[in-house]
C-alpha cells in the first residue's frame, strides 16, 4: 500500500554525510561544495576551487577552498611548489640556504626562516658537506693555517711571527720561535 | 676518541615518567648539535628530538612534542632526555647521536625503554 | 614529512657479490641523503653523507650516488662483516630514515 521508498542512506562511511535533507557523496579533491545532492545517496554539486586557493581531501564536505598561502619573502622563504587546486604552495629554502626554526621549542610545522649556509673558506675552513650551519661542520684549517683554539690561524710570514707546536707542525716551520 | 653512554632506561607504567642521560666524552656537547634517536623492537630508526649547538632551539617529533624534553648540563657535558606520560608506543631502544650537519657521526649503545602495565 | 622508501626490504646475497640498495624520497631532497649501516645489537653507523661522500674510516667499497628522489648505495663486493640492515636518512626537511634494507647471507 504504501510508495517504493527510496534507496537507504545510512550516511556511514567517509564518502556521504548529511547534508539539509539527504545523506551526499562528498566532492573531490581540488573542489569545493556548491549545492547538496537533492536525493538520497546522490552526488553533492562540486565546483573547482578558484585560483589561489586548495582542497586537498578527498570526498569531503567543505564549502569552500582554503587559501594558499604565500612564502613569507621577509623570512627569505621561496615557493619549491607552487600551489594547486590540490595542494598548498609548499614554502622551503632557496640553494645554498637552509631551514632555521623560528620559535625555540621546534615541530615540523613551525614557522621558520631561511638562514644562508655557512661559507667555510671564509673561516679558512675545507667545505666538508654541501650546506654547513656550522663552524663544526666545516673540514680542518685550509693550507697555510692552523688550528688555534676554535678557529684557523693563518701561518706568519716571517720569522718575526709566534709558531707554537702546532702552527710548526702544520706551518713548516723548524724551530720554534 | 668519542665516545656516548646513555643511561636511565627501564621498565615503567603507561603514563610514567623516566629521566634518560647520555654521557658524553672525547669532545664538547656545547659545540655541536645533539639528536635523540629511538628503534622499537624489530623495527626501523625514528628521529626523536634534537638541541642545538647553542642550546637556544630544541625539536621534536610530532609523536613526542609535548611529552618529551630535550636538555644539556655542559659542565657535566651529558645529554638528557625527560620522558613524561609514556605510551606503550614509546618501547624501544634509545640512543642518543652527536649531529655532522643533520647527520648523526657518533652514537651511543643505546638504553631500552620498556613501557608495560 | 618526507616519506623514504627503501627497496628491497631483504637482499640475498653471497660475499663477493655487488649490492645495490635504493632510496627513493617522497619528494626532492637534493643531495641531502645518508646511509647508515647497524649490525644486531649494535648502534648504527654513518657511511655514506651528502648522497656521495665517504664517511671517516669506511671502506671504499661502499658507495653513494643519486640526488632529488632517487639514491643508491652501492657495495661493490661484499665482506662478511657487511651483513647487515642499511638505512638511509634525509636532512633536506626535517629529519627521516628510510625502513631499511636487510642484506643477508645467501
Known amino acids: 500500500q504504501g510508495g517504493t521508498r527510496s534507496p537507504r542512506c545510512d550516511c556511514a562511511g567517509d564518502f556521504h554525510k548529511k547534508i539539509g535533507l539527504f545523506c551526499c557523496r562528498g566532492c573531490p579533491a581540488g573542489h569545493y561544495l556548491k549545492a547538496p545532492c537533492t536525493e538520497p545517496c546522490g552526488n553533492s554539486t562540486c565546483l573547482v576551487c578558484p585560483q589561489d586557493t586548495f582542497l586537498a581531501w578527498e570526498n569531503h564536505h567543505n564549502s569552500e577552498c582554503a587559501r594558499c598561502q604565500a612564502c613569507d619573502e621577509q623570512a627569505s622563504q621561496v615557493a619549491l611548489e607552487n600551489c594547486s587546486a590540490v595542494a598548498d604552495t609548499r614554502c622551503g629554502c632557496k640553494p645554498g640556504w637552509f631551514v632555521e626554526c623560528q620559535v625555540s621549542q621546534c615541530v615540523s610545522s613551525s614557522p621558520f626562516y631561511c638562514q644562508p649556509c655557512l661559507d667555510c673558506g671564509a673561516l679558512h675552513r675545507h667545505t666538508r658537506l654541501l650546506c654547513s650551519r656550522r663552524d663544526t661542520d666545516c673540514g680542518t684549517c685550509l693550507p697555510g693555517f692552523y688550528e688555534h683554539g676554535d678557529g684557523c690561524v693563518s701561518c706568519p710570514t716571517s720569522t718575526l711571527g709566534s709558531c707554537p707546536e702546532r702552527c710548526a707542525a702544520v706551518c713548516g716551520w723548524r724551530q720554534m720561535f | 676518541e668519542v665516545q656516548l653512554l646513555e643511561s636511565g632506561g627501564g621498565l615503567v607504567q603507561p603514563g610514567g615518567s623516566l629521566r634518560l642521560s647520555c654521557a658524553a666524552s672525547g669532545f664538547t656537547v656545547s659545540r655541536y648539535a645533539m639528536s635523540w634517536v629511538r628503534q622499537a623492537p624489530g623495527k626501523g630508526l625514528e628521529w626523536v628530538s634534537a638541541i642545538s649547538d647553542s642550546g637556544g632551539r630544541t625539536y621534536y617529533a610530532d609523536s613526542v612534542m609535548g611529552r618529551f624534553t630535550i636538555s644539556r648540563d655542559t659542565s657535566k657535558n651529558t645529554l638528557y632526555l625527560q620522558m613524561n606520560s609514556l605510551r606503550a608506543e614509546d618501547t624501544a631502544v634509545y640512543f642518543c647521536?652527536?649531529?655532522?650537519?643533520?647527520?648523526?657521526?657518533?652514537w651511543g649503545q643505546g638504553t631500552l625503554v620498556t613501557v608495560s602495565s | 614529512e618526507i616519506v623514504l622508501t627503501q627497496s628491497p626490504a631483504t637482499l640475498s646475497l653471497s660475499p663477493g657479490e655487488r649490492a645495490t640498495l635504493s632510496c627513493r624520497a617522497s619528494?626532492?631532497?637534493?643531495?641531502?641523503l645518508a646511509w647508515y649501516q647497524q649490525k644486531p645489537g649494535q648502534a648504527p653507523r654513518l657511511l655514506i653523507y651528502d648522497a656521495s661522500n665517504r664517511a671517516t674510516g669506511i671502506p671504499a667499497r661502499f658507495s653513494g650516488s643519486g640526488s632529488g628522489t632517487d639514491f643508491t648505495l652501492t657495495i661493490s663486493s661484499l665482506e662478511p662483516e657487511d651483513f647487515a640492515v642499511y638505512y638511509c636518512?634525509?636532512?633536506?626537511?626535517?629529519?627521516?630514515f628510510g625502513q631499511g634494507t636487510k642484506v643477508e647471507i645467501k
Open positions: 636518512q634525509q636532512r633536506s626537511n626535517w629529519w627521516t
Open positions: 619528494q626532492s631532497v637534493s643531495s641531502y
Open positions: 647521536a652527536k649531529e655532522f650537519g643533520d647527520y648523526l657521526d657518533y
